[in-house]
């Protein structure tokens, strides 16, 4: 069976301040079992934007129903975008582990740029 791939189809997304940004991500397989997370930036200093497993992320909604059986779409929408939200967003698949989940594979990233709010 082919190994899971993380698909982020857009290289870049541009959104006006105050609007919502949709960041698209999908998996090619349901295996391995484990959550997905979204981060802004890469490396040790990356910022957690969304965790499928736990946490409260008031500005983030999932585009499709993540609890739906066989769902492979892990796209998110971030509301009320500000210039501070600019950066590169990574969709990351984790493999279920004990005691901690282990990072399995990351998407290529989508750069979010923020335009000035139309006057």
């Amino acid at each position: 069976e082919d190994e899971l791939q993380v698909i982020q189809p857009e290289k870049s997304v541009s959104v006006a301040a105050g609007e919502s940004a949709t960041l698209r991500c999908a998996m090619t397989s349901l295996i391995p079992v484990g959550p997905i997370m979204w981060f802004r930036g890469a490396g040790a200093g990356r910022e957690l934007i969304y965790n499928q497993k736990e946490g409260h992320f008031p500005r983030v909604t999932t585009v499709s129903e993540l609890t739906k059986r066989n769902n492979l779409d892990f796209s998110i929408s971030i509301s009320n975008i500000t210039p501070a939200d600019a950066g590169t967003y990574y969709c990351v698949k984790f493999r279920k582990g004990s005691p901690d989940d282990v990072e399995f594979k990351s998407g290529a990233g989508t750069e979010l740029s923020v335009r000035a709010k139309p006057s």
Partner: antibody, heavy 125, light 107 residues
């Protein structure tokens, strides 16, 4: 070898709709990006929109927003483009083309490397 | 939407000539640009992707360069089969957009 085979030529009346199909063979259809591009007689290429079946939703060029609907049926590996409220300026050759997918490492910016044969749509009263 | 402007709109050249076509994006697109060749009555053919990567099977006389907003397609020594129309396309962000095309004609 991946192929895209489109439905045949259509003649339509102004105000009506047309639905063109594009059947893919080979490759993993769900992760391909299928774009629709049109070319009016003597004119350049226009990207109308595209869909990646695994996501379900399509992206559209602003010019066609509200008038074009792009869908995909994973069970038959077929993409569809429906254009409504047809006018004479919609007379063109309509192409489907693929990018991304497993063959490219899921890189959708690697260009549209396989094209359908084109479908001529003529809008005339 | 990102606008793509190609120049010239047409060029007359002879076999063996070096031909250069330019494409400018209305905003930065990194190197996410493709070039296509189209002959009358035929579907377009992908020549170059990621601004400078040659598509498999395309002759090495075709080359691409550039990043950001300014890009170039060069045919180093024009062959009879190269007389066609060439289009650039940005694939950085949706909606993808094409340039207006450059027709390479026989002088």
């Amino acid at each position: 070898q991946v192929q895209l085979v489109q439905s045949g030529a259509e003649v339509k009346k102004p105000g009506s709709s047309v639905k063109v199909s594009c059947k893919a063979s080979g490759g993993t259809f769900s992760s391909l990006a299928i774009s629709w591009v049109r070319q009016a007689p003597g004119q350049g290429l226009e990207w109308m929109g595209g869909i990646i079946p695994i996501f379900g939703t399509a992206n559209y060029a602003q010019k066609f927003q509200g008038r074009v609907t792009i869908t995909a049926d994973e069970s038959t590996s077929t993409a569809y483009m429906e254009l409504s409220s047809l006018r004479s300026e919609d007379t063109a050759v309509y192409y489907c083309a693929r990018s991304g997918g497993d063959y490219s490492g899921y890189d959708y910016a690697s260009g549209m490397d396989v094209w359908g044969q084109g479908t001529t749509v003529t809008v005339s009263s | 939407d990102i606008q793509m402007t190609q120049s010239p709109s047409s060029v007359s050249a002879s076999v063996g000539d070096r031909v250069t076509i330019t494409c400018r994006a209305s905003q930065g697109i990194s190197s996410w640009l493709a070039w296509y060749q189209q002959k009358p009555g035929k579907a377009p053919k992908l020549l170059i992707y990621a601004a400078s990567s040659l598509q498999s099977g395309v002759p090495s006389r075709f080359s691409g360069s550039g990043s950001g907003t300014d890009f170039t397609l060069t045919i180093s020594s024009l062959q009879p089969e190269d007389f066609a129309t060439y289009y650039c396309q940005q694939v950085n962000s949706f909606p993808w957009t094409f340039g207006g095309g450059t027709k390479v004609e026989i002088k």
